[in-house]
Interface confidence: medium
């Protein structure tokens, strides 16, 4: 299902745009996986960590069959904007422990911003509405401790990894339907 009748596509080949988005998503997934592994080496995680402010995972094995391109792109963009905010917060609030990951966190943020720009371009080419997040943006509070910021980093990187993993699968599946 494409845009409503009467709304012209700017791009001649949305599949090529989608390919480009998939490549960027895959690249970011690899970076995130590498940084998450680096985090586990430097700061071993004692179990799974969660953060209430992170978005809930949008896709699962059960929902893959019913995916629609507008919904996937909109939700992915909203979720990635949330992760971008969390990465920016980590870089500012993390303290000296996380400063040792600064080059990698900075690169991750830059690639996340690039992917978001690509998704925005793709949505405009497909004449999809640039939906704003449903909920108001809640400011992220300071970590309770340095240890707390490390736990938050584990949660953010773990959540981003899962989100990107499902995004790659979802986008590839949607490409076959275009």
């Amino acid at each position: 299902p494409g845009p409503p009748a009467g709304s012209p596509r700017v791009s001649s080949d949305p599949r090529a745009d989608l390919d480009s988005a998939v490549l960027l998503t895959r690249s970011l997934l690899a970076d995130t996986r590498q940084l998450a592994a680096q985090m586990r080496d430097k700061f071993p995680a004692d179990g799974d960590h969660s953060l209430d402010s992170l978005p809930t995972l949008a896709m699962s094995a059960g929902t893959l069959g019913s995916l629609q391109l507008p919904g996937v792109l909109t939700r992915l963009r909203v979720d990635l904007m949330s992760y971008l905010r969390h990465v920016q917060w980590l870089r500012r609030a993390g303290g000296p422990s996380l400063k040792t990951l600064e080059p990698e966190l900075g690169a991750l943020q830059a690639r996340l911003e690039r992917l978001l720009r690509r998704l925005q371009l793709l949505m405009s080419r497909l004449a999809l509405p640039q939906a704003a997040p449903d909920q108001p943006v809640i400011p992220l509070g300071p970590p309770a401790s340095a240890w707390g910021s490390i736990r938050a980093a584990h949660a953010i990187l773990g959540g981003l990894h899962l989100t990107l993993d499902w995004a790659v699968r979802g986008l590839l599946l949607l490409k076959t339907r275009l």
Epitope: K42, G95, P96, K99, P142, P143, S145, W147
Partner: antibody
């Protein structure tokens, strides 16, 4: 309540060494990064060093790099500052401070180090 | 010379509003949170503002912080005699890999 108590200050000759301690209580010491900040008589605050909560990451001000070493013993809830090759310009009140991330939320009362011949 | 620049002194009469500025660069204020500390005569510094504009519990709402680009400011409204103290801004500096302070501003309540 959170308490930070510095000790080990005193008068020392240039070139000699001194070790400062900071005893922490009232919080889970091993969860917090810790800093040393100093203040020369009549002057402003100067950051000295920081150590991460588990002790593996350390950063120092250029003015003390290679001479001062920050360390901690989480089992004793104590922060240390080993000061070697002391100079007259190291004369200051030394404060230890706790940080949850990017700010110092609790400070000790300070200990005075005087480097003089 | 301090990495962050503050005016050495500021003054005001009781009830007045005073503002203290703090100027830095992209590697400190521009990319990290700004914190403000109050040091009353003969005492250790105390956290006044953190995360650019947040107040710890116990700090009166007469104190407020703000940031724009590579500059920050501390505003004190309804000035009181007990506000007479030294005020310091601070931030992490990514280039120096450490915390940098302003030179401090001595506030006098006339």
């Amino acid at each position: 309540q959170v308490q930070l108590l510095e000790s080990g200050g005193g008068v020392v000759q240039p070139g000699r060494s001194l070790r400062l301690s900071c005893a922490a209580s009232g919080f889970t010491f091993s969860h917090y990064d810790m800093h040393w900040v100093r203040q020369a008589p009549g002057k402003g605050l100067e950051w000295v060093a920081v150590i991460s909560y588990e002790g593996s990451n350390k950063f120092y001000a250029d003015s003390v790099k290679g001479r001062f070493t920050i360390s901690r013993d989480n089992s004793k809830n104590t922060l240390y500052l080993q000061m070697n090759s002391l100079r007259a310009e190291d004369t200051a009140v030394y404060y230890c401070a706790r940080t949850p991330g990017s700010h110092f939320d609790y400070w000790g009362q300070g200990t005075l180090v005087t480097v003089s011949s | 010379q301090s990495v962050l620049t503050q005016p050495p002194s500021a003054s005001g009469t009781p009830g007045q509003r005073v503002t203290i500025s703090c100027s830095g660069s992209s590697s400190n204020i521009g990319s990290n949170y700004v914190n403000w500390y109050q040091q009353l005569p003969g005492t250790a510094p105390k956290l006044l503002i953190y995360y650019d504009d947040l107040r710890p519990s116990g700090v009166p709402d007469r104190f407020s912080g703000s940031k724009s680009g590579t500059s920050a400011s501390l505003a004190i409204s309804g000035l009181r005699s007990e506000d007479e103290a030294d005020y310091y801004c601070a931030a992490w500096d990514d280039s120096l890999s450490g915390v940098v302070f302003g030179g401090g501003t001595k506030l006098t309540v006339l």
